[in-house]
Amino acid sequence: ASNFDCCLGYTDRILHPKFIVGFTRQLANEGCDINAIIFHTKKKLSVCANPKQTWVKYIVRLLSKKVKNM
């Protein structure tokens, strides 16, 4: 759910981290209406996720640790 590169809502599915290659943070105070995590998938899709949900935080942490260890 995105428009002009802004997420307008969140996915209601839980994505498996094996399909996700990276993420971008969307901040409500930087031109968009809501805070969001935009997950980038192996199939070049962008999925808007709720940054407060535990599964989202978990994947963000896993990806951040991967980057740190590279």
């Epitope: 839980i14 498996h16 981290p17 709720n50 407060k52 949900q53 535990t54 599964w55 935080k57 978990y58 942490r61 896993l62 951040s64 640790k65 740190k68």
Partner: antibody
């Protein structure tokens, strides 16, 4: 109603390993994270690590990385925590606890009864 | 040394109101919700408050939570003898050291 049932008390020597189990009953295993939290005698609660079984990927507190392995068997709805190179200060009650990963509160809403692990020579 | 800071003890007489503070940083309480747990000796912790101020079903409305900035607090009004226990705050932490952090615990004594 979901319940978490843990394995029984263990006594181990310093330098050895222990593996504790936590079996979920009464609900699907899908949208849960299971964490392990310990309480040493006279101390507070400490998060050891956790796993989202549907992801099959574990995460650990920095203090325990390299010494702990958390795994899940989805068929039996059981999560295991193995702690290696045990030290005297690993003596503690180890609790498993559930988080619903689709919610936005990160809270541990259901806890196991606890497993006492004693490290003694 | 716990990441979240709580006073080690608090006390009150039956019927009084007791408040426990929990102080953190922008990476935990400042950007994530806070939960509170009651721990009685020999038992598992029990969730009292989640999402800063929400009570699970079955938790008496004598327990209330609040959050402001990088601090949170738990209030127990109408203190009762069965409230004598240890109380812990907890929050997700966005730093890479470990995603879940607890306070050191506060022992509440009913005088």
């Amino acid at each position: 109603q979901v319940q978490l049932v843990q394995s029984g008390a263990e006594v181990r020597k310093p330098g050895s390993s222990v593996k504790v189990s936590c079996k979920a009953s009464g609900d699907t295993f899908n949208n849960f994270a299971i964490s392990w939290v310990r309480q040493a005698p006279g101390h507070g609660l400490e998060w050891v690590g956790g796993i989202i079984p549907v992801f099959n990927t574990a995460d650990y507190a920095q203090n325990f990385t390299g010494r702990v392995t958390i795994s899940a068997d989805k068929a039996t709805k059981t999560v295991y925590m193995e702690l290696r190179s045990l030290r005297y200060d690993d003596t503690a009650v180890y609790f498993c606890a559930r988080t619903k990963i689709e919610l936005d509160n990160d809270a541990f809403d259901i806890w196991g009864q606890g497993t006492m692990v004693t490290v003694s020579s | 040394q716990s990441v979240l800071t709580q006073p080690p003890s608090a006390s009150g007489t039956p019927g009084q109101r007791v408040t426990i503070s929990c102080s953190g940083t922008t990476s935990n309480i400042g950007s994530n919700s806070v939960s509170w747990y009651q721990k009685l000796p020999g038992t598992a912790p029990k969730l009292l408050i989640h999402s800063n101020n929400l009570r699970p079903s079955g938790v008496p409305d004598r327990f209330s939570g609040s959050k402001s900035g990088t601090s949170a607090s738990l209030a127990i009004s109408g203190l009762r003898s069965e409230d004598e226990a240890d109380y812990y705050c907890a929050a997700w932490d966005d730093s890479l050291s470990g995603p879940v952090v607890f306070g050191g615990g506060t022992k509440v004594t009913v005088l």
